[in-house]
Amino acid sequence: CEAPPTFEAMELIGKPKPYYRVGERVDYKCKKGYFYIPPLATHTICDRNHTWLPVSDEGCYREMCPHIRDPLNGEAILANGSYEFGAELHFICNEGYYLIGKDILYCELKDTVAIWSGKPPLCEKILCTPPPKIKNGKHTFSEVEVFEYLDAVTYSCDPAPGPDPFSLIGESMIYCGNNSTWSHAAPECKVVKCRFPVVENGKQISGFGKKFYYKATVMFECDKGYYLNGSDKIVCESNSTWDPPVPKCLKVSTSPTTKSPTSSASGPRPTYKPPVSNYPGYPKPDEGILNNLDD
């Protein structure tokens, strides 16, 4: 017989020879990192037809790392379903807990023993320190010193000393989230007041107000014979300016050689070049002005 078969988990005892006589026996042992569990044979004989009798390494089992329990408030998940060396054990924590230590352990071979690459991690409760205090405002639960996962606080602004109220800029409610950090930055309380929006040859058609505070929204239309250059809708933003800027109403050119004017500013505009009679602020007698504006 020629050289005996080789296996993943089993190796020949002694040196292999190039040829073996009929009836000659060779013995195998489990390789390093594997251990033998009877009854399967670990030897073979050179048969008279010059082939080796059947043998397998199925009696050799990988060394196994010790079983690790789920961490308290978490879970250990075997990546490939067994504890044999080469296995990966992934750790995750339940919602509201965070991992202290390595999130993956590897089953490794040290000499002939399979051991885990480190200590199992712990799952600790997510806690947040109190959220930031803000000028001209306050948050709920200001007396609490430690917040648990998903505990929420709500910010509100103080009454303003002057005629204009403080506006809350940002998220009014924030919660204790992953990484023991708050879900959003603390908001800001400040007076936000936009100027009265004046449009020559046009007028405001919605969003009327005594004063225009944060997020106030105003819409305009132009007089007959004028078209809107800019957006018909503007919003009072946190820096006390209108965004987009207050539009202008420009005179519609009646000269046939001139191109119909189109808006150069960002914001709603016709998606086609309407005839002069279809400009915003230049409606047909039987329809409202806003029918000719994009929403």
Epitope: K193, F196, K203
Partner: antibody, heavy 118, light 107 residues
Framework: EVQLVESGGGLVQPGGSLRLSCAAS????????ISWIRQSPSRGLEWLGV???????NYNSAFMSRFTISRDDSKNTAYLQMNSLKTEDTAVYYC????????????WGQGTLVTVSS | AIQLTQSPSSLSASVGDRVTITCRAS??????LNWYLQKPGQSPQLLIY???SLHEGVPDRFSGSGSGTDFTLKISRVEAEDVGVYYC?????????FGQGTKVEIK
Amino acid sequence: EVQLVESGGGLVQPGGSLRLSCAASGGSVSSYDISWIRQSPSRGLEWLGVIWTDGGTNYNSAFMSRFTISRDDSKNTAYLQMNSLKTEDTAVYYCERVYDGYPWFAYWGQGTLVTVSS
Amino acid sequence: AIQLTQSPSSLSASVGDRVTITCRASQGISNYLNWYLQKPGQSPQLLIYYTSSLHEGVPDRFSGSGSGTDFTLKISRVEAEDVGVYYCQQYIKLPWTFGQGTKVEIK
């Protein structure tokens, strides 16, 4: 609190020109929106125009061709330039601080009288 | 331009009377209406802005109401110091315009 004082009024012949001044004390004229308003027995109160803090202007179209509003920040003064004056322009002229960017007039000066007569 | 028409053009009241002045706009102006009082020999002074908001320092016997085209200024109990000419002013649209005035006298 800023005080606005009008000056430059007087007698002028029809067709003539006059420049009214509005001097600010206790504050910067460029920090406020300044409107000009006039009052006469025959025509009542008439808003003429405004110069905004950013230097932009809006006018009453009835006077746009003859009246111009400007500002000189170095002199801390706003101006109303009136050309081609007519007898019906005879009135007391007020410069007025627009209330905090809103078109209501809470800060009236004493005004300056302009008489257009030959 | 938007026209504002005040009525009556003049009225005479006794101290303590309730006085009502109306202002009608030639087109809808939402609540963008102010009221002024010009006392004899003085410049006008702001009484009410945005239809019903009292300007600082104005006594609460003054009140304003209305919306759209019809507006009212009321003095609940008129006093001697309330004499003068009352003006309304709109600011929804340029040019900002004033009413012709209502003269209030005390009997």
